[in-house]
């Protein structure tokens, strides 16, 4: 059975296609190719006589066709008009003709698509958004990508116009994209440049920071307002309903109880036409004009150097005060071994060294007053007693010798030493 096969079946415009012949009979006079599904002299492309090995162009020949001795037909630089059926007629020696029909499809090389949209600045929860993939071409599949992923299933996303148009039914701030469309046909595919959506939204309910509501007299009030919004919102403030400056930050130096009130931040977004606000309560406590004298409590006042640690605590009943520590007229901490904790209430020294011995005091203060504790004395002992394994050293030998006058002195010293040891053991 005579057959033809198109290589390839789907051809890119401008490329070539080979109509390959299978099962060609042996005894032949020649063969002819025709455009279409039947033999039609008016649509003959080329004829080939085997005896003369001569190819004769027909009326449908475009000059791009080449016929081979094996009856295969090559068509170069194909156009979309070349799409369709091709019929081969074989003239056998017994003058009985055989025919076979094949076909191929020519598709254009697709251009890089682009995305057009109906709205450059959609408003959140208000506007719909339609993206269209350009250009419109026949026999083309349209695909969409959001954030480099295929479209999620969502009731807010709709495809129409043969998938060429993507509609977001209600835009949210999370719909910024990027969006890409891809066009495909059997011979090519191309993807658009990404398009990012500028969704206008907000302003959301603002927040005022810091969150503190209670302040001390003399402090600086520095309130910052922030609201999620695109574009950035306009900020303004009200204190007890009275409009203040149109800034994001409200600053008042050295506040007093007269600054008590409700501090409202108002935000507006001209693009969305929306406003929002938040109110914060601020109360200012009057400072005590006189700070009471603090007291120092020590975990111990006599310590062993390089062994013990000590905690000194500055006690005060006043509120809204700060604490600082002093040692020999220097502010602390002065070394890695000194740590302040609990808002400077506690000074820890670990371990204590010889140079830590001396007078410590703390000072409590607020912006208008201060007071110092009485000093506390920290004694640091270094254990001058020998260790048990050193006590038996015969120091007399060290000091004895001809003409040595140290023996009597040493005897007296030895007695004092033993007394000290006895006293040390008695107290431990």
């Amino acid at each position: 059975q005579l057959t033809t096969e198109s290589m390839p079946f789907n051809v890119a415009e401008g490329k070539e296609v080979l109509l390959l012949v299978h099962n060609l009979p042996q005894q032949l006079f020649g063969y002819s190719w025709y455009k279409g599904e039947r033999v039609d002299g008016n649509r003959q492309i080329v004829g080939y006589a085997i005896g003369t090995q001569q190819a004769t162009p027909g009326p449908a020949n475009s000059g791009r066709e080449t016929i081979y001795p094996n009856a295969s037909l090559l068509i170069q630089n194909v156009t979309q008009n070349d799409t369709g059926f091709y019929t081969l007629q074989v003239i056998k020696s017994d003058l009985v003709n055989e025919e076979a029909t094949g076909q191929f499809h020519v598709y254009p090389e697709l251009p890089k698509p682009s995305i057009s949209s109906n709205n450059s600045n959609p408003v959140e929860d208000k506007d719909a958004m339609a993206f269209t993939c350009e250009p419109e071409t026949q026999d083309t599949t349209y695909l969409w990508w959001i954030n480099n992923q295929s479209l999620p299933v969502s009731p807010r996303l709709q495809l129409s116009n043969g998938n060429r148009t993507l509609t977001l039914l209600s835009v949210t701030r999370n719909d910024t994209g990027p969006y890409e469309c891809e066009i495909q046909n059997p011979v090519s595919a191309n993807r658009s440049d990404p398009v990012t959506l500028n969704v206008t939204y907000g302003p959301d309910t603002p927040t005022i920071s810091p969150p503190d509501s209670s302040y001390l007299s003399g402090a600086n009030l520095n309130l910052s307002c922030h609201s999620a919004s695109n574009p950035s919102p306009q900020y303004s403030w009200r204190i007890n309903g009275i409009p203040q400056q149109h800034t994001q930050v409200l600053f008042i130096a050295k506040i007093t109880p007269n600054n008590n009130g409700t501090y409202a931040c108002f935000v507006s977004n001209l693009a969305t036409g929306r406003n929002n606000s938040i109110v914060k309560s601020i109360t200012v406590s009057a400072l005590s004009p006189v700070v009471a004298k603090p007291q120092i409590k020590a975990s111990k006042t006599t310590v062993t150097g390089d062994k013990d640690s000590v905690n000194l605590t500055c006690s005060t009943n006043d509120t809204g005060i700060s604490i600082r520590w002093f040692f020999k007229n220097q502010s602390l901490p002065s070394s890695e071994r000194m740590k302040l904790s609990q808002g400077n209430i506690t000074l820890s020294i670990n371990p204590v060294k010889r140079e830590d011995a001396g007078t410590y005091w703390c000072e409590v203060f607020n912006p208008i007053s201060k007071n110092q504790s009485d000093p506390i004395m920290l004694n640091v002992n270094y254990n001058a007693l020998p260790q048990e394994n050193l006590i038996n050293v015969d120091l007399e030998v060290l000091f004895q010798g001809p003409g040595s006058g140290l023996n009597d002195i040493f005897e007296a010293q030895k007695i004092e030493w033993h007394e000290a040891r006895a006293h040390h053991h008695h107290h431990h």
């Epitope: 509501s213 009200r238 309903g241 008590n260 109110v279 914060k280 109360t283």
Partner: antibody, heavy 121, light 108 residues
Framework: QVQLVQSGSELKKPGASVKVSCKAS????????MSWVRQAPGQGLEWMGW????????TYVEEFKGRFVFSLDTSVSTAYLQISSLKAEDTAVYYC??????????????WGQGTTVTVSS | DIQMTQSPSSLSASVGDRVTITCKAS??????VAWYQQKPGKAPKLLIY???YRKRGVPSRFSGSGSGTDFTLTISSLQPEDFATYYC??????????FGQGTKLEIK
Amino acid sequence: QVQLVQSGSELKKPGASVKVSCKASGYTFTEFGMSWVRQAPGQGLEWMGWINTKTGEATYVEEFKGRFVFSLDTSVSTAYLQISSLKAEDTAVYYCARWDAFEYVKALDYWGQGTTVTVSS
Amino acid sequence: DIQMTQSPSSLSASVGDRVTITCKASAAVGTYVAWYQQKPGKAPKLLIYSASYRKRGVPSRFSGSGSGTDFTLTISSLQPEDFATYYCHQYYTYPLFTFGQGTKLEIK
């Protein structure tokens, strides 16, 4: 129209707790603060403080700090006043009143009908 | 604390009378003063805010004036439904807002 509907009268023993509710309707609940006002028998009005319905932040007058707690359930547009460790002197009518803390100047423009709390052994 | 002293504590008047109630603050409170009307067993109702602004829906016979420390509520022509207790309220000293002790307006 704006309405504030409070829970019914309460009779409690000293040391007990009570929770008074105030359900708002006819406006956006979170756009206005809610104040609480006390009126002891035969006495005048005392402002107890207010709660920010947007943030939940409560501000109390010094006298009402500690045993008095303002709270909210914005899902049902309701503000609450809870009083713990009740004393005889807590016997009063408690009112919720809407306050626009943003505008501030408009004062307490709508009031609940009041809830009578009686503390007696 | 700012005290709001109302005078008189009570007064008797007849329908059609012009009535003035005064409120004196112990310190200046700007114009942060409101006036409320309360009838027995009922909640107070706002009449005037910011010293002189009438709340929407309040009859025009009610008016307020003053600033600083001295404030007045005037009822130009008493109506039968106006007999009630009236309170002034300062909301200047946040968060310690205070009310006057009340003025009881009775039928003569």
